[in-house]
Interface confidence: medium
């Protein structure tokens, strides 16, 4: 899967699927609150933390944002920092923890109806003030108000997995998130390691379905580390 090569402005701190630390690609990428270890579809954190350097919010975990560790610090040295809770100071949405957004410099609870308008303002494609070269498309990714009343089908824009129909999860796709199928037995899955590329996927896969976990495919044990294929397998 592709690293989240793209977005620097999109809202990232949204509640993860299944209540874990985003139990699918993008979750275990962060070094900031600790390493994330899979346990079924839940994740536990272990606090032998080392700061993870970053350039964009999307390179950090769901509960983090990318910034200089010290006020007025060298902008060239940025690390993933823990998100800010309700009523804490902020400068942008990504600084606030899941379920909150930045309003007038303070992290506040994201009432969905109000939040939708905020999304329309802030989930602009990362590169964007130039006019799109494409006809008939706004540069701004807007979310249909319908999505809060009907569950999104495969390919529908979403914010979180609860926006998607049964059997689907909300996963990143380029600069936005769409409903994608939860993985079935035998399908290729993404298992994050501490080493290597930490960025969130641009083409994110869902997590493995119930009763399945993401493990090295048996006939790939001998393969080199970089080419090991992980698939969803029965516990």
């Amino acid at each position: 899967t592709l690293n989240s090569v793209l977005n620097s402005n999109a809202i990232k701190n949204l509640p993860p699927p299944l209540g874990g630390a985003a139990g699918h690609p993008g979750s275990a990428v962060s070094a900031a609150p600790g390493i994330l270890y899979p346990g079924g579809n839940k994740y536990q954190t272990i606090d032998n933390y080392q700061p993870y350097p970053c350039a964009e919010d999307e390179e950090c975990g769901t509960d983090e944002y990318c910034a200089s560790p010290t006020r007025g610090g060298d902008a060239g040295v940025q690390i993933c920092l823990a998100c800010r809770k309700r009523r804490k100071r902020c400068m942008r949405h990504a600084m606030c923890c899941p379920g909150n957004y930045c309003k007038n410099g303070i992290c506040v609870s994201s009432d969905q109806n109000h939040f939708r308008g905020e999304i329309e303002e802030t989930i602009t494609e990362s590169f964007g003030n130039d006019h799109s070269t494409l006809d008939g498309y706004s540069r701004r990714t807007t979310l249909s108000s319908k999505m809060y009343h009907t569950k999104g089908q495969e390919g529908s824009v979403c914010l979180r997995s609860s926006d998607c129909a049964s059997g689907l999860c909300c996963a990143r796709h380029f600069w936005s998130k769409i409903c994608k199928p939860v993985l079935k037995e035998g399908q290729v899955c993404t298992k994050h390691r501490r080493k290597g590329s930490h960025g969130l996927e641009i083409f994110q896969r869902c997590y493995c379905g119930e009763g399945l976990s993401c493990r090295i495919q048996k006939d790939h044990h001998q393969a080199s580390n970089s080419s090991r294929l992980h698939t969803c397998q029965r516990h």
Epitope: E125, F127, E154
Partner: antibody, heavy 121, light 106 residues
């Protein structure tokens, strides 16, 4: 007018290295993700690598992972592809291409003219 | 990885003909599909994006349709400048191209 101009191609021996450049003009370079796409002689198109507008994040096709490195210098409006441990199968015309925003399919809306890389002993 | 299969791999047609090229994905890709035209020695050119949207400056004789796994590029009335190779490309999961369809003069 949007323009992308590749350079740096040439003949190199297997195992050798080469660095391709793509000079961009006519648009705000730092706001666009960019990719390298290649085409072996008489064959189809193959995507190679992508980089975000800020350069903060990159990704590679499995066929080049660990050997190629994409980077960009936004102050120079230039995209790069460092190619190491080159193989005969890397022989191709290499195009740099810009990703359009605005549609979920994020197509390649502008392409350079390409630069030929030949890997041969 | 998602495989993209184009058919036919080549076809012969005359000016004024209606030409249809199909592209099939090995799994669901929604409408995350683009079409390109490439002439010998030249870079590809974007024709259709997101399955059915005509790129600015592309003649209206080109159209795209389909969603899910099956897609079609149609040239309603083939012109001399349309003889080229056409590629589909998906961006639902990674970025992969079809093998191409060469449109030749009959």
């Amino acid at each position: 007018e949007v323009q992308l101009l590749e350079s740096g191609g040439g003949l190199v021996q297997p195992g050798g290295s080469l660095r391709l450049s793509c000079a961009a003009s006519g648009f705000t370079f730092s706001k666009y993700a960019m990719s390298w796409v290649r085409q072996a002689p008489g064959k189809g198109l193959e995507w190679v690598s992508i980089i975000s507008g800020s350069g903060g994040t990159t990704y590679y096709a499995d066929s080049v992972k660990g050997r190629f490195t994409i980077s960009r210098d936004n102050s120079k409006n230039t995209l790069y592809l460092q190619m190491n441990s080159l193989r005969a199968e890397d022989t191709a015309v290499y195009y740099c291409a810009r990703h359009a925003h605005g549609a979920g399919s994020y197509p390649f809306d502008y392409w350079g003219q390409g630069t030929l890389v030949t890997v041969s002993s | 990885d998602i495989q993209m299969t184009q058919s036919p791999s080549s076809l012969s047609a005359s000016v004024g003909d209606r030409v249809t090229i199909t592209c099939r994905a090995s799994q669901y890709i929604g409408t995350y599909l683009n079409w390109y035209q490439q002439k010998p020695g030249k870079a590809p050119k974007l024709l259709i994006y997101a399955a059915s949207n005509l790129q600015r400056g592309v003649p209206s004789r080109f159209s795209g349709s389909g969603s899910g796994t099956d897609f079609t590029l149609t040239i309603s009335s083939l012109q001399p400048e349309d003889f080229a190779t056409y590629y589909c490309q998906q961006s639902y999961s990674d970025l992969t191209f079809g093998g191409g369809t060469k449109v030749e003069i009959k």
